[in-house]
């Protein structure tokens, strides 16, 4: 089979601070040195790009400065963290991996991680 398999957890619960982390692992059919990782969000059949980063194997992932994502890589694993999440951001977060260089190009898309975000209750006013 030539297609690249991408694995990611089925469900993740964001922290009370709106941070969610998950691992995206890909079974590389080739010896890639340049990899692009994109996080897609699917909600109500609409798909949007959350963030994307291209990295050289062994180096850190570099997202844009205003990105809500950060990440680290280790071999064929990418540890992704999405921050600033609110309840309305609950949805299916899909990891898309592309082996960009050297040729040949390969594509792998995970089944998605359902991220649940619960907005924290506001602290009650205290008289003390």
């Amino acid at each position: 089979c030539k297609a690249m398999h991408v694995a990611q957890p089925a469900v993740v619960l964001a922290s009370s601070r709106g941070i969610a982390s998950f691992v995206c692992e890909y079974a590389s059919p080739g010896k890639a040195t340049e990899v692009r990782v994109t996080v897609l969000r699917q909600a109500d059949s609409q798909v949007t790009e959350v963030c994307a980063a291209t990295y050289m194997m062994g180096n850190e992932l570099t997202f844009l400065d205003d990105s809500i994502c950060t990440g680290t890589s280790s071999g064929n694993q990418v540890n992704l963290t999405i921050q600033g999440l609110r309840a309305m951001d609950t949805g299916l977060y899909i990891c898309k991996v592309e082996l960009m260089y050297p040729p040949p190009y390969y594509l792998g898309i995970g089944n998605g991680t359902q991220i649940y975000v619960i907005d924290p209750e506001p602290c009650p006013d205290s008289d003390f």
Epitope: K2, A3, E49, T54, P104, Y106, L107, I109
Partner: antibody
Framework: QVQLVESGGGVVQPGRSLRLSCAAT????????IHWVRLAPGKGLEWVAV????????YYADSVKGRFTISRDTSKNTLYLQMNSLRAEDTAVYYC???????????WGRGTMVSVSS | DIQMTQSPSSLSASVGDRVTITCRAS??????LAWYQQKPGKVPKLLIY???TLQSGVPSRFSGSGSGTDFTLTISSLQPEDVATYYC?????????FGQGTKVEIK
């Protein structure tokens, strides 16, 4: 709206050159891979070339490798296909197409006709 | 490179008929398969991606199925406006290969 518009086609003699352009509007050009696909008379669709994201990675079909060069100008939201050493078998309608978020070709231009004939 | 083989190369059916087009990949491509419709003199249009997901705005009479090497495009009730050539395409790896096309006509 999201749109791709090709230009630059025409009639050219074998061995000569031509440059096709593809102007993109309505989406973040640098977030997508853009492909060239052609349809020769009486034939099926044939993938020609792709340029990715920031333009650092390009791939070509074996049939055009070494003769065609794909490039992009992000400041102009425009894709180019420089076609050198043209042959009769390069005669086709050339389309640019966007690789969508799922990587299938979701947006296509209207196409531009290239005819290589002496 | 992966080869995509479509069958039949052409077919003629009556309005309202159920039409099935098959596509076989020479190697496993998971579900990285798209179907396109190209009407005579028109631009190709994405119908289905990820083997079975209908592109927004495409009529529900079109459906796709399959995974691995064998895929199917089905038109549940053929309409006059469906006269076109249909192409499958794999996008799991370079080069991005199309099937040779299936020409659909009305009897």
């Amino acid at each position: 709206q999201v749109q791709l518009v090709e230009s630059g086609g025409g009639v050219v003699q074998p061995g000569r050159s031509l440059r096709l352009s593809c102007a993109a509007t309505g989406f973040n050009f640098s977030s997508y891979g853009i492909h060239w696909v052609r349809l020769a008379p009486g034939k099926g669709l044939e993938w020609v070339a792709v340029i990715w994201y920031d333009g650092s990675n390009r791939y070509y079909a074996d049939s055009v490798k070494g003769r065609f060069t794909i490039s992009r100008d992000t400041s102009k939201n425009t894709l180019y296909l420089q076609m050198n050493s043209l042959r009769a078998e390069d005669t086709a309608v050339y389309y640019c197409a966007r690789a969508g978020l799922w990587s299938a070709f979701d947006i296509w231009g209207r196409g531009t006709m290239v005819s290589v004939s002496s | 490179d992966i080869q995509m083989t479509q069958s039949p190369s052409s077919l003629s059916a009556s309005v309202g008929d159920r039409v099935t087009i098959t596509c076989r990949a020479s190697q496993g491509i998971s579900n990285y398969l798209a179907w396109y419709q190209q009407k005579p003199g028109k631009v190709p249009k994405l119908l289905i991606y990820a083997a079975s997901t209908l592109q927004s705005g495409v009529p529900s009479r079109f459906s796709g199925s399959g995974s691995g090497t064998d895929f199917t495009l089905t038109i549940s009730s053929l309409q006059p406006e469906d006269v076109a050539t249909y192409y499958c395409q794999e996008y799991s790896s370079a080069p991005w290969t199309f099937g040779q096309g299936t020409k659909v006509e009305i009897k």
